[in-house]
């Protein structure tokens, strides 16, 4: 058993049929010595008396808010949560496996630049009685500071018969140099509590590997005389690291109709303009990627051909 | 300890081309190592990230773009002194800082070159003959060093009398390639910045 936060404790249980469970001793936070009784949750049934209460925790029915009283007055609470271990593996029931970039990916993180700021998000089908707490650091043995905000519900989607909820959190490395060469990864730890179930999820990454620039901005078209060719120009996104001659981007320019199966014109360039063939009912799209370290491409920025 | 804005004429910076070739060559070699050594811990997640130049050179700090010198997190650098007569310095007005930067890059390349050559000698003794260093990568390191054209003491190639542990050598190769790729990215950024300045 360990303390998650004040008056909240996590009991780690091997979860299999007829498992013996864990013996837990609760101590009432009071100078009083006698006349103390214990109850669980809203029940008035007295579970025991005395300053300490010994319980055998085997299942969710044994978890919950234990309260010690004296003469009708509440002295203190202890909330017990369960963390299940099945076949040596901690349960991952609360969050959905996003399967990208690989199986067992519960947390996904992205950074728009090298400033040390990043966003992580996760998915769940649970809508109520759910809380998250996020911690982060650079490295684990001698951790350096990363400050994370509160996790918030950022999107709701309907997937078939199920509703899916996306939560996200923003973090900022306390002293980040955009030009630095990372040798220790960022560690992100998410504590998830659903009712009386506790789970924790972790992700480890280098900022350089989670870079995804914003789309290029200010796309403009200039038709070329006596030609079907069009000059398309754009600018670096505002959120990208500066100077741009040091943090350079490369671009992919594509002309395509509404369907992905349609024919297309595609060209890659390091410049902020390109010449392509425009077709009726097609769009010109441009996306960006770090020129020197191939992490993710940005989303497309698009303008219609006509 | 930063790069000045007024440096060589645009397009005249001879090291840019070599640095692009360097990044390409090390990236290809790393990809080849990951594929060939698929049953070894050779991915970014599996290896320890070591920097053989740590406390010996200070390329990131010495080559910091002027715009980042206002960022205090970028300025916790160690003082290092270097020789200052490189041929990539295409202008007489080139500052001392830029010479420090390019000479730091030269020292990095020299250190990695020695490590890679030593390692290749060991890998050539491996009866499995599983992986060798790409000669193209070694040639590209050499080309960039020649373009930088700094005079410095030759680092003797490490020779070892004991029987090499090929498993450890291959893991060391992965560690070295990952670190060198990261440094090659920095070098490429620096050359691009200087070329644009």
């Amino acid at each position: 058993i360990w303390e998650l936060k004040k008056d909240v404790y996590v009991v780690e249980l091997d979860w299999y049929p007829d498992a013996p469970g864990e013996m837990v001793v609760l101590t009432c936070d009071t100078p009083e010595e006698d006349g103390i009784t214990w109850t669980l949750d809203q029940s008035s049934e007295v579970l025991g008396s005395g300053k300490t209460l010994t319980i055998q925790v085997k299942e969710f029915g044994d978890a919950g808010q234990y309260t010690c009283h004296k003469g009708g007055e509440v002295l203190s609470h202890s909330l017990l949560l369960l963390h299940k271990k099945e076949d040596g593996i901690w349960s991952t029931d609360i969050l959905k496996d996003q399967k990208e970039p690989k199986n067992k990916t519960f947390l996904r993180c992205e950074a728009k630049n090298y400033s040390g700021r990043f966003t992580c998000w996760w998915l769940t089908t649970i809508s109520t009685d759910l809380t998250f707490s996020v911690k982060s650091s650079r490295g684990s043995s001698d951790p350096q500071g990363v400050t994370c905000g509160a996790a918030t519900l950022s999107a709701e989607r309907v997937r078939g018969d199920n509703k899916e909820y996306e939560y996200s959190v923003e973090c900022q490395e306390d002293s980040a140099c955009p030009a630095a060469e990372e040798s220790l990864p960022i560690e992100v730890m998410v504590d998830a509590v659903h009712k009386l179930k506790y789970e924790n999820y972790t992700s480890s990454f280098f900022i350089r590997d989670i870079i995804k620039p914003d789309p290029p901005k200010n796309l403009q078209l200039k038709p070329l005389k006596n030609s079907r060719q069009v000059e398309v120009s754009w600018e670096y996104p505002d959120t990208w690291s500066t100077p741009h001659s040091y943090f350079s981007l490369t671009f992919c320019v594509q002309v395509q109709g509404k369907s992905k199966r349609e024919k297309k014109d595609r060209v890659f360039t390091d410049k902020t303009s390109a010449t392509v063939i425009c077709r009726k009912n097609a769009s010109i799209s441009v996306r960006a990627q770090d020129r020197y370290y191939s992490s993710s491409w940005s989303e497309w920025a698009s303008v219609p051909c006509s | 300890r930063n790069l000045p804005v007024a440096t060589p004429d645009p397009g005249m910076f001879p090291c840019l081309h070599h640095s692009q070739n360097l990044l390409r060559a090390v990236s290809n070699m790393l990809q080849k190592a990951r594929q060939t050594l698929e049953f070894y811990p050779c991915t970014s997640e599996e290896i320890d990230h070591e920097d053989i130049t740590k406390d010996k050179t200070s390329t990131v700090e010495a080559c910091l773009p002027l715009e980042l010198t206002k960022n205090e997190s970028c300025l916790n650098s160690r003082e290092t002194s270097f020789i200052t007569n490189g041929s990539c310095l295409a202008s007489r007005k080139t500052s001392f800082m830029m010479a420090l930067c390019l000479s730091s890059i030269y020292e990095d390349l020299k250190m990695y070159q020695v490590e890679f050559k030593t390692m290749n000698a060991k890998l050539l003794m491996d009866p499995k003959r599983q992986i060798f260093l790409d000669q193209n990568m070694l040639a590209v390191i050499d080309e960039l060093m020649q373009a930088l054209n700094f005079n410095s003491e030759t680092v003797p190639q490490k020779s070892s009398l004991e029987e090499p542990d090929f498993y450890k050598t291959k893991i060391k190769l992965c560690i070295l390639l990952h670190a060198f790729r990261i440094r090659a990215v920095t070098i490429d950024r620096v050359m691009s910045y200087l070329n644009a300045s």
Epitope: R228, Q229, T250, R261, E262, K263, K264, D265, R266, V267, F268, T269, D270, T275, I277, R279, K280 | -
Partner: antibody
Amino acid sequence: QVQLVQSGAEVKKPGSSVKVSCKASGGTFSDYYLHWVRQAPGQGLEWMGWIDPENGDTEYAPKFQGRVTITADESTSTAYMELSSLRSEDTAVYYCARNKELRYFDVIGQGTLVTVSS
Amino acid sequence: DIVMTQSPLSLPVTPGEPASISCRASQSISINLHWYQQKPGQQPRLLIAFASQSISGVPSRFSGSGSGTDFTLTISSLQPEDFATYYCQQSNSFPLTFGQGTKVEIK
């Protein structure tokens, strides 16, 4: 399976014209760009131009501008390349090629040898 | 027009050995570079698109690398059926242009 079948070999006199056909099968004809590329005996490849069969848009290499005409007939899934004012240096194998991507070729026809000789 | 220069023009290789062909562009073309193989009496066949993207059905021993002006086609271990002429093609701008070809011959 996508295939491009070209018309047979031709022998032409200098100053005349030649029209080579290329019939496509497999996939929708107008879903692809069609190009013509030629190769003189023992020489390399030379791009001549492309057509978008959907709208008839064409683009020609400056070298062949005014001398080459590329057309397409959607009803028969056939593209044509006509080269006029033939000279002996136009002796080559002419290939049609196609792709959903405009700028390179993933399927290439078997080629048509055009010999220009007096 | 962008001029593509291949080297060497002829490359004698022992079967089972690796081979590398170089292609250089007269100006930077990013990764807009494609490789084709042509056997005598046959049409060219696409091997690699956009400098390094493998093409379905092409053996994995063929790989491409490069960006900007310098590109390489590598055959990791030459098989008897790989002896042919190889062409690079730029798609950075029209007109599309090819290298003059590299003939890989049996040593």
